[in-house]
Structure formats: structure tokens, C-alpha cells
Interface confidence: low
């Protein structure tokens, strides 16, 4: 038998420095976790102790903190090279700065193969990108070879900016011929490494003949066998075993997100490349693991530019940006309107002639807006200012919800109105009218939403049975501020871009902003 150790990360999202337990900014270093310096210590420890080790990443290194805003992917290439990753699959966020923003900083600079079998380039891009990413790679490991085949969410055109010259095919359809090709090359140990979410990972394990192991990402799935070491609740055992259509037991793994854990899977193969056994668990990268001093010094060197960036002007406001709790938790506030407008602008994807855009609606909990910005400082807006408004390091995500769920969410928004609670919703692409004289749960008297399947956007009444796309903070998608109905009833959830980055990009694009209070949220009494 031959034993392989697979170390894996996914959805690191720009967490190069150590973070707090909830993956936000590290405050108390003695209780911080993750970061590439700590990851390197653990990886090197395992490499020294075990003979056949692969370090893999399942995508979405891009996007999540100021590191990506400033360095635009150069930091990913640099530190993944430093950690000697063996392979990476492309995630949807790797396309956030367009194809050029993937090619130049990452694909050209990575010293490891970057993979996706279901992305096909066409037109002028085909020759430009040729060889920079691959459908699969055969890696020598000890005296054996292992095939790694990559895949990426076919939803990427709706989630990011891959442009019109990349075609995202069905994962299973695209993977099978590549796996077959590996078999003809006498590669009998094959790992599918990709970024399409846990449900698709399980389908690949079930449907793609010849895949021995699936290492996934995108859904931030935490799997664990035994008592979990931190706050994350396991979605199943690690590894999660799928019985394939041809009767094999295929281990499927994912390692949560944000570099908090290092996935650790040991696989035993027989001489014909069949999996005999698989076991392991994610390793919590807590402060008991020291940060590697050379990588840490490198992080500190790169850090300098970030501190300079955070005080540079992004754009100007000529109006007061009212982000006070006295406004945003009680009524429409122009800071909420600005943020929602930025969220929609960040999700403009003209992928279908029938639609002016695939999404028109935004909701945002007023309690998530933590500070105003005064225009009397020469109108200047900096990253530092925005970090005070949005200090939690969240993301603005895309969900699909039924109209009935949205109606419940708006009822929840005002169910205890007047107590300065955070669940009061700020909106974009929505006109809502509340009647507070009615009993809680029955206060929404009008709810109109901006059409998407139209050439001239206009507001139509919400339909209870229709499925709508909505942009919202990950905090709400996860049921925060009591929005349990969103978490329980959402039909799809794709994580999006860092909140501050979305707003800063919008302000930089607009140059001068003047958001108004314009009647998106109204209060009435009496009949309608």
C-alpha cells in the first residue's frame, strides 16, 4: 500500500495575516488564528514528518481584505509560492478583477499549476491564456504520480467578471473526459480539486468515474470527525464518504474558509490505485502553532503599503453620509442607500439580453452601518473612513429567495420598531411602506421591487411565489439579527466580495457622490 497526505485550504479570501476566531481583524494576538505564517509552520512540520505530501488549494484566494484591494493578487502568487503549494483550482473570485486581473498577477507568477477543466477560452483570449491554466496536472509524489483535475463553479459569470471569452461548462460533463485521459496515461490515483460547493463535490464523487478523492471549496463547508475544536458546527464527518455509481467509496473534503483550518487527509492506495482507507480532520491553526518568522517578516514587509493605502483618498462626498444609528435603525438613511447602490453596481452582469441585469435588489441591516462620514473634511473619503462604517470584515453575497421569504424579512425588519435594534433594513431596488399602527408581523402594507427582466427598470408588486435574486450581507444570509427565515428558506447562496471593497470601488468609480434620502422606505397610517 502507498500512503498520501493531502493538505488543503479553500476560500482563504485574502486572510494573509492571522485573524480573530471569527476571521475578522486580529485584536488579541494570543487568541488569533490562521494566517500564512502559521499555516507554513504546520505545513513544514507535516512535510518533514511524512513522506508523500501534497498541499492543495480549492480556489477563492482572491477577495476579502485590504490585502487584495491593494496588491490585486500579487500577494496570492507570492505567498502561495512561498508556501510551495502543489496545485490550485480556480474559484469564482479569481475573476473579480477580470481575466487580466487573473492572468498578470497570478497565472503568470504562480510556480504551481492552476487548474480548471470546465473553463474553456475562446476568441482572442484562447491564445493569450493558453497554458496559463490547465485542465489537469500530473504531479510526481515520492516514487508515484498523482493526477489532479480542476473545476470551477459554472455560476462564475453571475458571481464575478470573467468576461465573454470564457465558457463555463457543466463540471461533470467536462471532468469525465479529462479523468479518462489521465487513465490512458496510466495515472491511477486521481484527485478532483475544485470550487463549486459541497453539493457539486458530492455529485462529482458520485458521477465522475475514476475520481478517487474530491477536495472542494465555495460553500465554506466545515466537516469534522469527533468534537470540533472551535465554533464551527460540522456539516458531516471528515472525510465525507460518497458511494459512487460504480460502487467505490469516495472521500470528499473541504476545510471551512479564511485559512482558519488546514485540511489534513491521509489516503491509503493499493497497487492498482484504489482507495483502501481515508482518515483525518481539519487542523485548527490556533496560537499554539507559532508563526514562521521568515514568512511573518515577509508579511510585515508587504504590510507597509497597506497602511499607506488606507489613508489615501478614494473619492469625495459633497453631502453628509448619515450612518448614525439614530437614522439607519429607524428610517431610510443615505449611507444605507449608498451602500446598497454600491452592492448592486458591483453585481452588474449583462449575461442575457432578456435582462438589464440578473439582480436588482439589495437589503442591508441598519445595525451593520456603524458610523457616519462628515463631508466637511474637504469631502475626502478614505478606506479608513469606510472601515469605521463597515468594521466587521463581512461580504456582500448573492442569494435567491422566494417573495414570501422577503415579505417575512421585511416584517421582521419592523417587528419591534422603535428600540434602536439592528434589524431595520436599508434597501436598494425596493420600495417598502410600513404601517406601524398594525400589529407586528402585519406591518408591511406595500412592497414593490425593481424588475430585472425588462429594458426599462420599473417597480412592480412583489410576487409571493416568484424567486428573486437579492444582494445582502453574509451576516443576513447566515440568519443574523434574527433573520432566521433567510437562512432557513434561501434557495441559493453564493459568497461575494468584501464589503468595504465593494463600497470603495464604487466611490472610486463615481469620484464624487451625493446619495439622497429618496423615498425607498416610507411609513403610513390607514388604508392603501
Amino acid at each position: 500500500a502507498w500512503e498520501l497526505t493531502i493538505l488543503h485550504t479553500n476560500d482563504v479570501h485574502s486572510r494573509l495575516e492571522q485573524t480573530s476566531e471569527d476571521s475578522s481583524k486580529c485584536v488579541n494576538a494570543s487568541r488569533c488564528m490562521g494566517g500564512v505564517a502559521r499555516l507554513f509552520t504546520k505545513v513544514q512540520q507535516i512535510r518533514r514528518a511524512e513522506p508523500n505530501v501534497l498541499l492543495l488549494d480549492a480556489g477563492d484566494q482572491y477577495q476579502g481584505t485590504i490585502w487584495f484591494t491593494v496588491y490585486k493578487g500579487a500577494e496570492v502568487a507570492h505567498f502561495m509560492n512561498a508556501l510551495r503549494y502543489d496545485a490550485m483550482a480556480l474559484g469564482n473570485h479569481e475573476f473579480d478583477n477580470g481575466v487580466e486581473g487573473l492572468i498578470e498577477p497570478l497565472l503568470k507568477e504562480a510556480k504551481f499549476p492552476i487548474l480548471s477543466a470546465n473553463i474553456k477560452a475562446k476568441g482572442p483570449l484562447a491564445s493569450q491564456i493558453s497554458g496559463l491554466y490547465l485542465p489537469y496536472k500530473v504531479l510526481p509524489v515520492g516514487d508515484e504520480v498523482v493526477g489532479i483535475v480542476g473545476y470551477t463553479s459554472k455560476e462564475t459569470p453571475f458571481l464575478s467578471n470573467p468576461g465573454t471569452n470564457l465558457v463555463f461548462e457543466d463540471e461533470i460533463t467536462a471532468l469525465q473526459p479529462e479523468v479518462d485521459k489521465l487513465k490512458t496515461l496510466n495515472v491511477n490515483k486521481i484527485i478532483a480539486l475544485g470550487h463549486s460547493g459541497f453539493e457539486m463535490d458530492k455529485l462529482i464523487a458520485q458521477k465522475v468515474r475514476g475520481v478517487d478523492v474530491v477536495v472542494g471549496g465555495h460553500s465554506n463547508t466545515f466537516l469534522y470527525t469527533g468534537n470540533p475544536p472551535s465554533k464551527e458546527v460540522p456539516a458531516g464527518k471528515y472525510p465525507f464518504i460518497v458511494t459512487s455509481d460504480d460502487g467505490r467509496k469516495v472521500p470528499v473534503v473541504q476545510a471551512y474558509a479564511f485559512g482558519k483550518y488546514l485540511g489534513y487527509l491521509k489516503i491509503e492506495f493499493d497497487e492498482r490505485g484504489n482507495v483502501i482507507s481515508s482518515h483525518g480532520n481539519p487542523i485548527l491553526l490556533n496560537s499554539s502553532i507559532p508563526e514562521d518568522p521568515s514568512i511573518k517578516a515577509d508579511i510585515n514587509k508587504w504590510r507597509i503599503k497597506l497602511d499607506n493605502y488606507s489613508t489615501q483618498e478614494l473619492g469625495k462626498t459633497i453631502v453628509y453620509l448619515d450612518g448614525s444609528s439614530q437614522s439607519c435603525r429607524f428610517r431610510e438613511c443615505n449611507m444605507g442607500n449608498l451602500i446598497c447602490d454600491a452592492m448592486i453596481n458591483n453585481n452588474l452582469r449583462h449575461t442575457d439580453e432578456m435582462f438589464w441585469n440578473h439582480v436588482s435588489m439589495c437589503i442591508l441591516n441598519g445595525g451593520g452601518i456603524r458610523s457616519p462620514i462628515d463631508e466637511r473634511n474637504n469631502g475626502t473619503i478614505t478606506w479608513e473612513n469606510l472601515a469605521a462604517v463597515l468594521p466587521f470584515g463581512g461580504t456582500f453575497d448573492l442569494v435567491q429567495l422566494k417573495g414570501s421569504t422577503l415579505k417575512k424579512a421585511f416584517e421582521h425588519s419592523v417587528h419591534r420598531y422603535g428600540q434602536s435594534t439592528g434589524e431595520f433594513l436599508q434597501v436598494g431596488g425596493i420600495h417598502v411602506v410600513y404601517d406601524l399602527s398594525r400589529k407586528p408581523g402585519d406591518r408591511v402594507v406595500k412592497l414593490d421591487v425593481l424588475c430585472t427582466k425588462c429594458r426599462v427598470p420599473s417597480y412592480d408588486p412583489l410576487k409571493m411565489d416568484e424567486v428573486y435574486k437579492v444582494i445582502l450581507p453574509n451576516f443576513l444570509a447566515n440568519g443574523g439579527d434574527g433573520f432566521q427565515m433567510i437562512k432557513d428558506e434561501l434557495l441559493r447562496h453564493d459568497s461575494g466580495d468584501q464589503d468595504i471593497n465593494v463600497v470603495s470601488t464604487y466611490i472610486s468609480k463615481m469620484k464624487v457622490i451625493y446619495p439622497a434620502v429618496e423615498g425607498r422606505i416610507k411609513f403610513s397610517t390607514g388604508s392603501h
Epitope: A74, A77, H78, N81, A82, K108, K111, D298
Partner: antibody, heavy 120, light 107 residues
Framework: QLQLQESGPGLVKPSETLSLTCTVS??????????WVWIRQPPGKGLEWIGS???????DYNPSLKSRVTISVDTSKNQFSLKLSSVTAADTAVYYC????????????WGQGTMVTVSS | DIQMTQSPSSLSASVGDRVTITCRAS??????LNWYQQKPGKAPKLLIY???SLQSGVPSRFSGSGSGTDFTLTISSLQPEDFATYYC?????????FGGGTKVEIK
């Protein structure tokens, strides 16, 4: 402190192959934050990037020299080498080896350089 | 290849002067620009990486700025040891290319 030292013949005949070695001391060539590069500077002229190599053997050559250049690495000796075939007088230069920090690709440590003259 | 054009090719200055050297790329290179100092008979020495970040151990009188196609190296108060040739290098695209150099001489 990391140091680089170039070595090899100072005189090469036209049409022959120029061979230089760079020995890395005070650190490991396996340090994966870096890769290793050859640069040359003809007398009184500017700098030209010849090509680079990563510890794992991956290379990247300047297209203008690609057909004549081979860069290799010997991790057991902590060395990397340059071979430039079919040399002419235009290849007369000071040849430097240097360390490149991946990411911004800045050359943060250089050898002192070795003068190679191509002449019969 | 990306062409890097430095100006001036040489300049004369006195100790204490503020000196500015410019480097222009033939296409946008974001912030992928490094600056080096070379003294006669010596290897170049890294001064600035990523357009504006000062390399460890380099005096703070050296500073870099710019992004896209236009970059500047500034020496705020020229010292005797600063008389040398300065090169810019783009690290955005292969092959990595250098500017032709700017020689700073004593007036």
C-alpha cells in the same frame, strides 16, 4: 546573511558555450519565497534580464536569448548555473546572478558579477 | 517587450540638492516597478520595490512614486555616496526589462 558568488571562465571563444555557476551561501536555494536569476551588463551599457529558475527547476528565459540559454539548478550543491551557446562578441558582458523575491520580482541580493569576454 | 525609458540619461547635481529621475513604461505596469542604484565596478543594489516601498536598510531620503506608466525616484537631499547610476525595472510582464539608466554626477 545570504551571499551569491559567480564563477566560471573569464574568456570564451566565439561559437563556444559560456558556462557560469552561482553558489548560494548563508541560505538555502530551496527557500520558496525566492527564485534565482541571471542578469548581464555589456561594458558601458545597461542591464539585461537573461532568465530565471525556481528551486523546483521551472525556468523562464528572455525570448531574445531563449534559443541559446539553459539555466539549471543543483539543490544538493546550493548552486544554479547558466549556459549560453554559440557566443559572439556581443555576449561580452559582466554576468550577475541575483535572487528575485517573488511577487514584486525585485532583485534584492546580487552577486558581485563576473566579467566574461568573448574573443578568439 | 515593455520598453522602459529613463530621463534624463545623466544629470549633474550638488550635495544637498533634491534630485528627481523619471521612468516611463511603454504600457501600463500597475505598481510593478523597482529601482536600483549601481556604483562603478559594483553590482546594482535594490532601493525601492513595488514603485514606492523602501527596501530595508535604504535611507529614507530615497522615495518612489507613480503607477501605470509614469514613475519617479526622488532623492530629497543628495549625499556624496549617492553619486551613481540608477536603473528602473518593470516586473509586470515577461521579459523583465530595465531602463537605460540615469547617471548622477557631481556638479
Amino acid at each position: 546573511q545570504l551571499q551569491l558568488q559567480e564563477s566560471g571562465p573569464g574568456l570564451v571563444k566565439p561559437s563556444e558555450t559560456l558556462s557560469l555557476t552561482c553558489t548560494v551561501s548563508g541560505g538555502s536555494i530551496l527557500s520558496s519565497s525566492y527564485y534565482w536569476v541571471w542578469i548581464r551588463q555589456p561594458p558601458g551599457k545597461g542591464l539585461e534580464w537573461i532568465g530565471s529558475i525556481y528551486y523546483s527547476g521551472g525556468t523562464d528565459y528572455n525570448p531574445s536569448l531563449k534559443s541559446r540559454v539553459t539555466i539549471s539548478v543543483d539543490t544538493s550543491k546550493n548552486q544554479f548555473s547558466l549556459k549560453l551557446s554559440s557566443v559572439t562578441a556581443a555576449d561580452t558582458a559582466v554576468y550577475y546572478c541575483a535572487r528575485v523575491m517573488s511577487g514584486w520580482l525585485d532583485l534584492d541580493v546580487w552577486g558581485q558579477g563576473t566579467m566574461v569576454t568573448v574573443s578568439s | 517587450d515593455i520598453q522602459m525609458t529613463q530621463s534624463p540619461s545623466s544629470l549633474s547635481a550638488s550635495v544637498g540638492d533634491r534630485v528627481t529621475i523619471t521612468c516611463r513604461a511603454s504600457q501600463s505596469i500597475n505598481s510593478y516597478l523597482n529601482w536600483y542604484q549601481q556604483k562603478p565596478g559594483k553590482a546594482p543594489k535594490l532601493l525601492i520595490y513595488a514603485a514606492s516601498s523602501l527596501q530595508s536598510g535604504v535611507p529614507s531620503r530615497f522615495s518612489g512614486s507613480g503607477s501605470g506608466t509614469d514613475f519617479t525616484l526622488t532623492i530629497s537631499s543628495l549625499q556624496p555616496e549617492d553619486f551613481a547610476t540608477y536603473y528602473c525595472q518593470q516586473a509586470y510582464a515577461r521579459p523583465r526589462t530595465f531602463g537605460g539608466g540615469t547617471k548622477v554626477e557631481i556638479k
